[in-house]
């Protein structure tokens, strides 16, 4: 846990027959149907993998 | 620090128009989804639209297509939501919020993480 | 759309209870679910993501399991702070939908 890998999805876009591809920062959202900035998972029982704000970790291209 | 800020309510007659901003500030919105939800007095939560700003992929509520339309301007960080032909059942507050996304197993494991304070609309004649 | 049904619409119970809610999906949404509490004139707060993650900063008493399309969140032992509405959500696929919400009151 904790390290970041290209997810190729599986999931169909509504519009769309081609599978969704999403960089190293991102993940598929079925609901928006849209690769979108992902955060590191974690779990109850182990906390946030990192001190930061949830929704501010490890994501170099968005502003500080 | 993640803030949303929503502006514009107020008092509007049925048939009118009226336009919300939700400012987003501490992360940027092209690489989220943002979401309007509604809370009319006394009720529950009703979600009403969403934005993908990166490429501008909108879906709304059955209750609010064809009368309101969901935008966002990446250069402001904000989103807005355009209420056309008013009627006395759109009065409620109005929140924007922030979809976060968790990298999990099954892919993405989401929620609205940030809400905004509300913004007040009343329909009335 | 799918549908989300809260049971109960409302509950009282005391300091210190168990607290159950329980929401069901009209169809499967695999474990696309989130957990929000509301006070009085403030907007939401996430309680619980992906059907059972706790969301930081939320007490360790908060908890919520569940798949496909039975869910419950679980107090364990309430506090008079947690005396709210609490509404579930899905977001397996648009529309997301809320359920109508379960008010916990004092006994």
């Known amino acids: 846990m904790g390290a970041r890998r290209l997810r190729v999805r599986s999931q169909r876009s509504r519009d769309s027959s081609v599978p969704t591809q999403c960089n190293q920062t991102e993940c598929f959202d079925p609901l928006v149907r849209n690769c979108v900035s992902c955060e590191l998972f974690h779990t109850p029982d182990t906390g946030h993998t990192s001190s930061l704000e949830p929704g501010t970790a490890l994501q170099p291209q968005e502003g500080s | 620090e993640v803030q949303l800020v929503e502006s514009g309510g107020g008092l509007v007659q049925p048939g009118g128009s009226l336009r919300l901003s939700c400012a987003a500030s501490?992360?940027?919105?092209?690489?989220?989804?943002i979401h309007w939800v509604r809370q009319a007095p006394g009720k529950g939560l009703e979600w009403v639209a969403w934005?993908?700003?990166?490429?501008?992929?909108?879906d709304y509520a059955d209750s609010v297509k064809g009368r309101f339309t969901i935008s966002a301007d990446t250069s402001k960080n904000t989103a807005y939501l355009q209420m056309n032909s008013l009627r006395a059942e759109d009065t409620a507050v109005y929140y924007c919020?922030?979809?976060?996304?968790?990298?999990?197993?099954?892919?993405?494991?989401?929620?609205?993480?940030?809400w905004g304070q509300g913004t007040l609309v009343t329909v009335s004649s | 759309d799918i549908q989300m049904t809260q049971s109960p619409s409302s509950l009282s119970a005391s300091v210190g209870d168990r607290v159950t809610i329980t929401c069901r999906a009209s169809?499967?949404?695999?474990?696309?679910v989130a957990w929000y509490q509301q006070k009085p004139g403030k907007a939401p707060k996430l309680l619980i993501y992906?059907?059972?993650n706790l969301y930081s900063g939320v007490p360790s008493r908060f908890s919520g399991s569940g798949s496909g399309t039975d869910f419950t969140l679980t107090i364990s032992s309430l506090q008079p702070e947690d005396f709210a509405t609490y509404y579930c959500?899905?977001?397996?696929?648009?529309?997301?939908?809320f359920g109508q919400g379960t008010k916990v009151e004092i006994k």
């Open positions: 919020a922030r979809r976060v996304c968790y990298s999990s197993v099954r892919g993405c494991a989401g929620a609205m993480d940030y």
């Open positions: 501490g992360f940027t919105i092209s690489r989220r989804s």
């Open positions: 934005i993908t700003p990166s490429d501008g992929n909108t």
């Open positions: 169809q499967d949404v695999s474990t696309a």
């Open positions: 992906g059907a059972s």
């Open positions: 959500q899905q977001s397996h696929a648009s529309p997301p939908t």
